[in-house]
């Protein structure tokens, strides 16, 4: 992008090809067929002056490109940052013997700022530059390119200025940006270790050792030291200061974490509030303890809330169809505070004479969509044995269930396969409707297909659309549904159960609670 660009404070730019207005006009050798100046558009539709070469079909390429003269401004060591894009030789057909994926960087010191020709012998090699990532054709989007950035340094320099040169030996390459800069050592205070202002050394071998001092309640493995190098950068500290565990940085000091807060490690992080369902009872805590009955899973970070296993699934409903069973249930009332809830199905085959003698069903039974790790609240179980008692347990599990497994996390139902379930109930009536209750009555199914053990009434508010239903079971052919809301439409379904399992639910009966008691006879359809 044209115009000035922002760089780190310790870097002084001597050349930036992206800041040059108009053509760069660098010198290429040969004049034609080698490096070529090309204008491309960046993501802001601003032209960028680049140099490209792609002589990949013929061996022994030797194409040179030289910058204009660059003043040294007293710097003894300079840095060259090259942003370039290199095309993968594999993306160019039929050039494997001749295509290269590197180029060479050279420099030449001179007091003459107007040298017109490239004399290769005058140049000293800085390095061979290779790409971290080359790209195939499909990697270039609408002017979004994979750019490689390589930085090299050269010195000590002594003349007034210098030229840079780029030698292509047969690559498909574009120089998108060339920046030359030198560095000044900045004043710094780092990691709770104080380092005074320091002047850089005279050459590459002279490093100025600087000792830092740690603040209170911080620790050092070794004495904190940094070296100010000739490149104007502080080199990586030998030792460093960090606030101790249980302490945090505040205004350049290390203070103890308050009660209810913690910090686990000697890091530069702040103290954090104890996550939900955990606590600390002293200042300077390094961890928080989970409340009784709450746990952390192995992969839960110390910063995550403590959680607990879920309660049992609700409203387990079974439908037997010969040697298949469909089970459906509602989510647990309490998920334990976790999102990773799933369901496991346990199938037990039980003796007819003694239901307590149950054995695992084995691998012959099939579950749809699966037996364990169910994310949905329904499962189909097939390939059961005929005329057999089965007990199915639905376990709600989450990431901490293993720490406190309990029968409270499961709900079970016992069914018998291969017996016909009762037919549906044809007529359900609302005998009495009050503000808070509905008295229901119904007839026995036309085809009981055995002894009816009980009836199950499922009801829900009409506008809830069966999202949240309730179940009432009764041995009689009538029941009072209490605890309803006044002036609310409810939908009721009834079904019968025999030893063979449940029949189908009746047609819905819609009843609206009222403010004055009245007797209403339902006809199995809507009633208000």
């Amino acid at each position: 992008v044209t115009g000035s660009r922002v760089y780190p404070a310790n870097e002084v730019t001597l050349l930036d090809s992206r800041s040059v207005q108009g053509e760069l006009g660098w010198i290429a050798s040969p004049l034609e067929g080698g490096w070529e100046e090309v204008s491309i558009m960046d993501e802001k539709n601003t032209p960028i002056r680049t140099y490209q070469v792609c002589n990949v079909m013929e061996a022994s390429q030797n194409n040179w490109l030289r910058t204009d003269w660059i003043t040294r401004e007293g710097a003894q060591r300079v840095y060259i940052e090259i942003k370039f894009t290199l095309r993968d030789c594999n993306s160019l057909p039929g050039v494997m013997g001749t295509c290269k994926e590197t180029f060479n960087l050279y420099y030449y010191e001179s007091d003459n700022d107007k040298e017109r020709f490239i004399r290769e012998s005058q140049f000293g090699k800085i390095d061979t530059i290779a790409a971290d990532e080359s790209f195939t054709q499909v990697d270039i989007g609408d002017r979004i390119m994979k750019l490689n950035t390589e930085i090299r340094d050269v010195g000590p320099l002594s003349k007034k200025g210098f030229y840079l040169a780029f030698q292509d030996v047969g690559a498909c390459i574009a120089l998108v940006s060339v920046r030359v800069f030198y560095k000044k050592c900045p004043l710094t205070v780092r990691n709770l270790a104080q380092f005074p202002d320091t002047i850089t050394g005279a050459d590459t071998s002279s490093l100025v050792e600087v000792r830092g001092s740690c603040v209170n309640n911080s620790e050092e493995k070794d004495v904190p030291k940094m070296y100010c190098g000739a490149d104007g950068e502080w080199l990586v500290p030998i030792g460093n200061c960090l606030c101790n565990a249980g302490h945090e940085e505040q205004n350049g000091e290390c203070q103890a974490c308050k009660i209810g807060y913690y910090k686990a490690l000697s890091t530069d992080a702040s103290c954090a509030k104890c996550p939900p369902h955990s606590y600390s009872v002293w200042e300077g805590a390094t961890s928080c303890t989970c409340d009784r009955g709450f746990f952390r899973a192995d992969n839960d970070a110390a910063s995550m809330p403590c959680t607990r296993p879920p309660s049992a699934p609700l409203n387990l409903i079974s439908n037997v169809n010969e040697t298949s069973v469909n089970l459906e249930w509602s989510s647990p009332q309490n998920t334990g505070g976790r999102q990773d809830i799933s369901y496991n199905v346990v199938c037990k085959k039980c003796g007819a004479g003694d239901p307590s003698k149950c054995r695992p069903c084995g691998s012959g039974v099939h579950y749809t969509p699966q037996q364990n790790g169910l994310k949905t609240t329904r499962v189909s179980i097939t390939d059961l044995l005929a005329h057999t008692n089965y007990t199915f347990e639905i376990w709600a599990v989450n990431g901490v269930s293993k720490y406190n497994p309990s029968p409270d996390q499961s709900v079970s139902v016992t069914v018998t396969t291969n017996q016909a379930a009762p037919s549906s109930i044809a007529l359900v009536q609302a005998k009495e409707v009050t503000r808070y209750s509905v008295a229901l009555a119904w007839l026995e199914p036309d085809r009981p297909n055995g002894v009816i053990l009980e009836y199950e009434v499922k009801y829900y508010e009409k506008d809830q659309n069966e999202r949240s239903y309730r179940i009432v079971r009764t041995a009689a052919r009538n029941t009072d549904i209490k605890g309803l809301n006044p002036l609310t439409s409810y939908v009721f379904h009834v079904r019968a159960r025999t030893a063979a399992g449940y029949g189908d639910f009746s047609e819905p009966l819609e009843v609206t609670t009222n403010t004055v008691p009245s007797r209403i006879i339902g006809d199995g359809a809507n009633s208000t």
Epitope: E32, G33, V38, I40, M41, Q52, C54, N55, V56, M57, E58, T85, L86, R87, L92, P93, G94, V95, G97, T98, Q137, V138, D139, I140, G141, D142, R143, C172, I173, A174
Partner: antibody, heavy 121, light 106 residues
Framework: QVQLLQSGAEVKKPGASVKVPCKAS????????MSWVRQAPGQGLEWMGW????????TYAQGFTGRFVFSLDTSVSTAYLQISSLKAEDTAVYYC??????????????WGQGTLVTVSS | EIVLTQSPATLSVSPGERATLSCRAS??????LAWYQQKPGQAPRLLIY???TRPTGIPDRFSASGSGTDFTLTISRVEPEDFAVYYC????????FGQGTKVEIK
């Protein structure tokens, strides 16, 4: 000055063969691949394939295998297109075009003036 | 084989007006697309490669954009010498041309 020079028009009978030359000048012949493009009268452009002028290895487009052969004579910087068993539907202008690979993309940057091949009994 | 569809087939513009030509690929070609200009009785001329890069010598009134399947060639102010047929061409493993758009005088 970079240019590709093709021969004049050819009139051939069905079943005959024709060899269309394309002479390159102004650049190193073996440094750029050569493409061949067909344009039937009043129709659009059809890419026939290309030849690596350094290795002599040809690549043919779908529909241009068998009767069509690309060849080179690097000593005279010339590429050739030979068509055998000519048919009436081969009547077209045949262009040679220099292939340019770049970092930013590829294209055919220099074209011959075209050779009209007419197949008629 | 990747099919390139150009639209419109014919574009009528007056000199000085802006012309916008479209090229759509049957599957993504990334930025591997070139544009050519062909005048009657002449060989085609390369206008754009890499979807948006102009070779040296092509006037800056020609610009292009796009990637994937949708590409556009724009002539900002049509000059008399710009009336011609324009072809797009993709260069994947096999190269194909579009059927062409004729830019004619209104």
């Amino acid at each position: 000055q970079v240019q590709l020079l093709q021969s004049g028009a050819e009139v051939k009978k069905p079943g005959a063969s024709v060899k269309v030359p394309c002479k390159a000048s102004g650049y190193t012949f073996t440094s750029r691949a050569m493409s061949w493009v067909r344009q039937a009268p009043g129709q659009g452009l059809e890419w026939m394939g290309w030849i690596n002028t350094n290795t002599g290895n040809p690549t043919y487009a779908q529909g241009f295998t068998g009767r069509f052969v690309f060849s080179l004579d690097t000593s005279v910087s010339t590429a050739y297109l030979q068509i055998s068993s000519l048919k009436a539907e081969d009547t077209a202008v045949y262009y040679c075009a220099r292939v340019r690979f770049t970092v930013y993309g590829d294209g055919m940057d220099v074209w011959g003036q075209g050779t009209l091949v007419t197949v008629s009994s | 084989e990747i099919v390139l569809t150009q639209s419109p087939a014919t574009l009528s513009v007056s000199p000085g007006e802006r012309a916008t030509l479209s090229c759509r690929a049957s599957q993504s070609v990334s930025s591997n697309l070139a544009w050519y200009q062909q005048k009657p009785g002449q060989a085609p001329r390369l206008l754009i490669y890499g979807a948006s890069t102009r070779p040296t010598g092509i006037p800056d009134r020609f610009s292009a954009s796009g990637s994937g399947t949708d590409f556009t060639l724009t002539i900002s102010r049509v000059e008399p010498e710009d009336f011609a047929v324009y072809y797009c061409q993709q260069y994947g493993p096999s190269w194909t041309f579009g059927q062409g758009t004729k830019v004619e005088i209104k």
